[in-house]
Interface confidence: medium
């Protein structure tokens, strides 16, 4: 069977006026997954995103991440899109005073 990923979005200051947003998917099986940042609903180009390898996490499941740099104040335009085993979900960038957003996808 399949195990749905836990998706976690974080933000960190990159440079003045910019922030780096990172979307992490963990504890999923099988290893095939789509994880990408979207702006206004459409996927960003590959060259504006950085991906981590899909790695085993030691529990028979996998983990990966994708990050991109965006302008501070435009967070609401960006979402992390995840597709795994025929299911998909969308995850927002947390507001500045809340650095974590967890969602276990069912």
């Amino acid at each position: 069977g399949s195990v749905p990923p836990m998706v976690n979005v974080t933000r960190s200051e990159a440079s003045e006026g910019n922030i780096t947003v990172t979307c992490r998917a963990s504890s999923f099986y099988p290893r095939n997954i789509t994880l990408t940042w979207r702006q206004d609903g459409v996927s960003l180009s590959h060259d504006t995103q950085q991906w981590g390898d899909v790695l085993p996490d030691g529990n028979g499941t996998y983990q990966t991440w994708v990050a991109t740099r965006i302008c501070q104040g435009e967070e609401q335009r960006f979402t992390c899109y995840m597709e795994h085993s025929g299911n998909h979900s969308t995850h927002p960038v947390p507001s500045g005073n809340s650095h974590h957003h967890h969602h276990h996808h069912h």
């Epitope: 960003l44 180009s45 504006t48 609401q76 927002p92």
Partner: antibody, heavy 122, light 112 residues
Framework: QGQMQQSGAELVKPGASVKLSCKTS????????ISWLKQKPGQSLEWIAW????????SYNQKFTAKAQLTVDTSSSTAYMQFSSLTTEDSAIYYC???????????????WGQGTLVTVSA | DVLMTQTPLSLPVSLGDQASLSCRSS???????????LEWYLQKPGQSPKLLIY???NRFSGVPDRFSGSGSGTDFTLKISRVEAEDLGVYYC?????????FGGGTKVEIK
């Protein structure tokens, strides 16, 4: 493709607010981006803002930031736009429209409501 | 804001004619993801607009193949190979690449 049913015509006084609704059916509401657009009689269209029903995230045309507020009620699959401090310049037909990022990977206003006529008059 | 300019304002045609509508953007409308989100809509009197073409040249579902879109950068064209009565109305081009998304002023296709 689903349905988008907008609320009926409104006659409102200057300075008042109005809340328009767009009730959807036939598709998974929370997967969708809904935009609102304005069209004055005999004129072109203006995009006001979008809302992503899954998260409530929004993006506004700066021109309408102080005027419009978009919300959704996922339990009834309905999108709302509240328009405030109305003037005669706000008299127009307002449309809701659904984006189609899944089926065609990038069509903005694929499916439209029938429009709501708002008339601002003393 | 990206200004979308459509010409002509009015296009008188005879049924069966080919019609060519032009749309020019004030700046390049390639999205940061590499796609060009240029769309064409038709609005008939008393109706909501309907999507015809998305991403410059892709016909939306149910749109007849007499409609075709082309162009790149800042210059775009919608062609109707043989105008039928149901094609009459106002055509709007639209760019969804740069916020705020903007429409052209429209071209009215009417009987000559």
């Amino acid at each position: 493709q689903g349905q988008m049913q907008q609320s009926g015509a409104e006659l409102v006084k200057p300075g008042a607010s109005v809340k328009l609704s767009c009730k959807t059916s036939g598709f998974t509401f929370s997967d969708n981006y809904i935009s609102w657009l304005k069209q004055k009689p005999g004129q072109s269209l203006e995009w006001i803002a979008w809302i992503y029903a899954g998260t409530g995230g929004t993006s506004y045309n700066q021109k309408f930031t102080a005027k419009a507020q978009l919300t959704v009620d996922t339990s009834s699959s309905t999108a709302y736009m509240q328009f405030s401090s109305l003037t005669t310049e706000d008299s127009a037909i307002y449309y809701c429209a659904r984006h189609d990022y899944y089926g065609t990977s990038g069509a903005w206003f694929a499916y439209w409501g029938q429009g709501t006529l708002v008339t601002v008059s003393a | 804001d990206v200004l979308m300019t459509q010409t002509p304002l009015s296009l008188p045609v005879s049924l069966g004619d080919q019609a060519s509508l032009s749309c020019r953007s004030s700046q390049n409308i390639v999205h940061i993801n590499g796609n060009t989100y240029l769309e064409w809509y038709l609005q008939k009197p008393g109706q909501s607009p309907k999507l015809l073409i998305y991403k410059v040249s892709n016909r939306f579902s149910g749109v007849p193949d007499r409609f075709s879109g082309s162009g790149s950068g800042t210059d775009f064209t919608l062609k109707i190979s043989r105008v039928e009565a149901e094609d009459l109305g106002v055509y709007y081009c639209f760019q969804g690449s740069h916020v705020p998304w903007t429409f052209g002023g429209g071209t009215k296709v009417e009987i000559k």
